[in-house]
Interface confidence: low
């Protein structure tokens, strides 16, 4: 039995190419250290986008990634995808494992469904 | 108020099992994981294991491996410890134990298992 | 397994007398994720064990603030600074750092 993983199901990302949104866990089970991975599904394939680990000391994660960001607080992780592009549309999954204390813990989220328009090119001035 | 109520002292003869309760009460019972502490007579203390009473996921101590198996009752809030093919030197006080950001934040009162013929 | 030795097996002191109670790990319990899982625990006679410390320097809850906690990698200390009556009894160390975990021998603290 794994621990529940929650993430909303549709989210639109910005203008700038930003998709934000949270992803939480439960129980809590006062976890000392949680690594969280961003998987992105497509057809039957799963790609690790990036991948963290938060401790009570570390609550900003994905230093190594700059396209990802992230802020761990207790049972929930906000994270924030930048440099998207209309071609990663796609479903990205939210997987959870909770390292210390032990007995180990994994959960994945049902994913959500990233939907990224580009930006229309300004037309041309006159001026 | 969070607290372990543990069972009765046990006479046993050697070669027999026994298994002994942790009744918690004042918290959520599958949100914390639960410790078993051995302590011989005048002597110090050792971990067991822990077990996840969420999902009954158990992390060992090598040497109790075989000797010591863990199980919950979630509808009861109660977690259980086994003891095989008892010997003398199984004989101690063990204490539950759980966790809140320290390994034994809180204990059970212990049970006394007696191992003679 | 990690040993966690407390040379000192039976300590005594005076009322009102600070008190140094010492912890050496046989490795460093420093924890992959940056924590050391160092826990100090108090057992009267008759009694289960209670929590002083955690994480090498964190009292518990209504643990008086005489008690602290020091030290890093493989020596840790745990102070008294005035020894009231009630503080009397075994003092445990114990690592949560690697399994198996494990507890020091004990601090014996009485009254001189």
């Known amino acids: 039995e794994a621990i529940q993983v929650t993430q909303p199901s549709v989210v639109l990302a910005s203008s700038h190419g930003v998709a934000s949104f949270p992803c939480e866990y439960s129980p809590s089970h006062n976890t000392d250290e949680v690594r969280v991975t961003v998987l992105r599904q497509t057809n039957d394939q799963m790609t690790e986008v990036c991948a963290t680990t938060f401790t009570e000391k570390n609550t900003v994660g994905f230093l190594d990634y700059p396209f990802c960001s992230g802020t761990f607080n207790e049972s929930r992780v906000n994270l924030t995808i930048q440099g998207l592009r209309a071609v990663d549309t796609g479903l990205y999954l939210c997987k959870v494992e909770l390292m210390y204390p032990p007995p180990y813990f994994v959960g994945m989220g049902n994913g959500t469904q990233i939907y990224v328009i580009d930006p229309e090119p300004c037309p041309d001035s006159d001026f | 108020e969070a607290k372990l109520q543990e069972s009765g002292p046990v006479l046993v003869k050697p070669g027999a099992s026994v298994k002994m309760s942790c009744k918690a009460s004042?918290?959520?019972?599958?949100?914390?994981?639960m410790n078993w502490v051995k302590q011989s007579h005048g002597k110090s203390l050792e971990w067991i294991g822990v077990?996840?009473?969420?999902?009954?996921?158990?992390s060992y101590n090598q040497k109790f491996k075989g000797k010591a198996t863990l199980t919950v009752d979630k509808s009861s809030s109660t977690a259980y410890m086994e003891l095989n093919s008892l010997t003398s030197e199984d004989s101690a006080v063990y204490y539950c134990?759980?966790?809140?950001?320290?390994?034994?934040?809180?204990w059970g009162q212990g049970t006394l298992i007696t191992v003679s013929t | 397994d990690i040993v966690m030795t407390q040379t000192t097996l039976s300590l005594p002191v005076s009322l009102g007398d600070q008190a140094s109670i010492s912890c050496r790990s046989s490795?460093?319990?420093?924890?992959?994720?940056?924590?050391?899982?160092l826990e100090w625990y108090l057992q009267k006679p008759g009694q289960s064990p209670k929590l002083l410390i955690y994480?090498?320097?964190n009292r518990f809850s209504g643990v008086p603030d005489r008690f602290s906690g020091s030290g890093s990698g493989t020596d840790f200390t745990l102070k008294i600074s005035r020894v009231e009556a009630e503080d009397l009894g075994v003092y445990y160390c114990?690592?949560?750092?690697?399994?198996?975990?494990?507890f020091g021998g004990g601090t014996k603290l009485e009254i001189k």
């Open positions: 134990a759980r966790y809140y950001g320290s390994w034994f934040a809180y």
């Open positions: 004042g918290y959520t019972f599958t949100d914390y994981y």
């Open positions: 077990i996840n009473p969420y999902n009954g996921d158990t």
């Open positions: 490795q460093s319990i420093v924890h992959s994720n940056g924590n050391t899982y």
């Open positions: 994480k090498v320097s």
């Open positions: 114990f690592q949560g750092s690697h399994v198996p975990y494990t």
